[in-house]
């Protein structure tokens, strides 16, 4: 599998690793959004990681209200984080925007 | 780095690998798009090589109908591909839903 | 201490649109938290009618959607919202609320509730 | 939707009284249960949300428990400023939906 397909397979089956553990298999809880932020993304938690810190993310996340998030809500997410890490790719000296 | 944060990485190079070849360098123009699309994900485009096939994949990227492909579309994108994978990954038998 | 202030036109006739203001004070308006219109037909209980949040995402009461805009401004730390088509049905006192970003999404700072009649 | 019926509708007690208000789901909500207070031309207040967990600046003798479609909000003695009008409301999924209310009265 070529590099882009691998990181759509690491997308789907992290969350599954974390969203069957507990409740709807299907969506992720609280506290498995938590181990997932934890574990998986620790340079997006960074020093956040009090109890309201994680419920902001959660409840940022939560679009339909339910207090989980699916998968595509988790979609949504891991998106914006994207979005952040090509806005700092982007704006490196070295990528300045250049005639082509 | 962790394999989520891997697959971030890998998301936002790939999109600039292909989006610094020609024109505005921060978005995918056809022929790029193309090119992505052929090298980096061809599980998805299958035998769905002709001209009318990519022009539709364009068309449905491009929501802001400017004829590129800019980085938050592509995010969409890949977010529906995964949408698509997790509906299988889901729809296996070995992962049908369980009382847990 | 989170306040919030209810505005807009206490009379309505059938027919038009009722439009209602929210202004926020005591905390900045942030996408932290989600902001609820929530009504009371008189001597009767509380009805939800929708809410605007976290990238502007909205979600309205199935039974008032196609009736229903809400919006916010954060500039001037207010949300709104319209309903249109209005009939006495509608006649309740209308109240803004924060909703917390804690386990089940309370509602907890509310407005003091401003009566909105419909009536020719 | 998910329907919350409370009982009772209305009672009558003193103060000092062990007052019990109940609330019951027609699904399971998963504990994402709150009760609120509504005094005549006064905004309403958060007692208590997730079913147990008490709002900053309540008072200790408001207490909530339950599990599943059934709860329950207990004032364990009761004062003369608690006399007032209690809502239960689900925080499960949308839309969100409230109990009809409790109406504490003095005997």
């Known amino acids: 599998a070529r590099p882009l397909e691998e990181a759509l397979d690491v997308i789907v089956s992290t969350f599954h690793k974390y969203s069957g553990k507990e409740g709807d298999k299907f969506k992720l809880n609280k506290t498995e959004l938590k181990e997932l932020l934890t574990r998986e993304l620790p340079s997006f938690l960074g020093k956040r990681t009090d109890e309201a810190a994680f419920q902001k993310v959660m409840s940022n996340l939560d679009s339909n209200r339910d207090n989980e998030v699916d998968f595509q809500e988790y979609c949504v997410f891991l998106s914006c984080i994207a979005m952040m890490c090509n806005e700092f790719f982007e704006g490196c000296p070295d990528k300045e925007p250049r005639k082509k | 780095a962790r394999p989520l944060e891997e697959a971030l990485d890998v998301i936002v190079s790939t999109f600039h690998k292909y989006s610094g070849k020609e024109g505005d360098k921060f978005k995918l123009n056809k022929t790029e798009l193309k090119e992505l699309l052929t090298r980096e994900l061809p599980s998805f485009l299958g035998k769905r090589t002709d001209e009318a096939a990519f022009q539709k994949v364009m068309s449905n990227l491009d929501s802001n109908r400017d004829n590129e492909v800019d980085f938050q579309e592509y995010c969409v994108f890949l977010s529906c591909i995964a949408m698509m994978c997790n509906e299988f990954f889901e729809g296996c038998p070995d992962k049908e839903p369980r009382k847990k | 201490q989170v306040q919030l202030q209810e505005s807009g036109p206490g009379l309505v006739k059938p027919s038009q649109t009722l439009s209602l203001t929210c202004t926020v004070s005591g905390d900045s308006f942030t996408n932290d938290y989600y902001w609820n219109w929530i009504r009371q037909h008189p001597g009767k209980g509380l009805e939800w009618i929708g809410h605007i949040g976290y990238g502007g995402n909205i979600n309205y009461n199935p039974s008032l959607k196609n009736r229903l805009s809400m919006s916010r401004d954060t500039s001037k730390n207010q949300f709104s919202l319209k309903l249109s088509s209005v009939t006495a049905a509608d006649t309740a006192v209308y109240y803004c609320t924060r909703e917390s970003f804690y386990d089940g999404y309370p509602f907890d700072y509310w407005g003091q509730g401003t009566l909105v009649t419909v009536s020719s | 939707d998910i329907q919350m019926t409370q009982s009772p509708s209305s009672l009558s007690a003193s103060v000092g009284d062990r007052v019990t208000i109940t609330c019951r789901a027609s699904q399971d909500i998963r504990n994402y249960l709150n009760w609120y207070q509504q005094k005549p031309g006064k905004a309403l207040k958060l007692l208590l949300y997730y079913t147990s967990r008490l709002h900053s600046g309540v008072p200790s003798r408001f207490s909530g428990s339950g599990s599943g479609t059934d709860y329950t909000l207990t004032i364990s003695s009761l004062q003369p400023e608690d006399f007032a009008t209690y809502y239960c409301?689900?925080?499960?999924?949308?839309?969100?939906?409230f109990g009809g209310g409790t109406k504490v009265e003095i005997k």
């Open positions: 409301q689900q925080g499960n999924s949308l839309p969100r939906t």
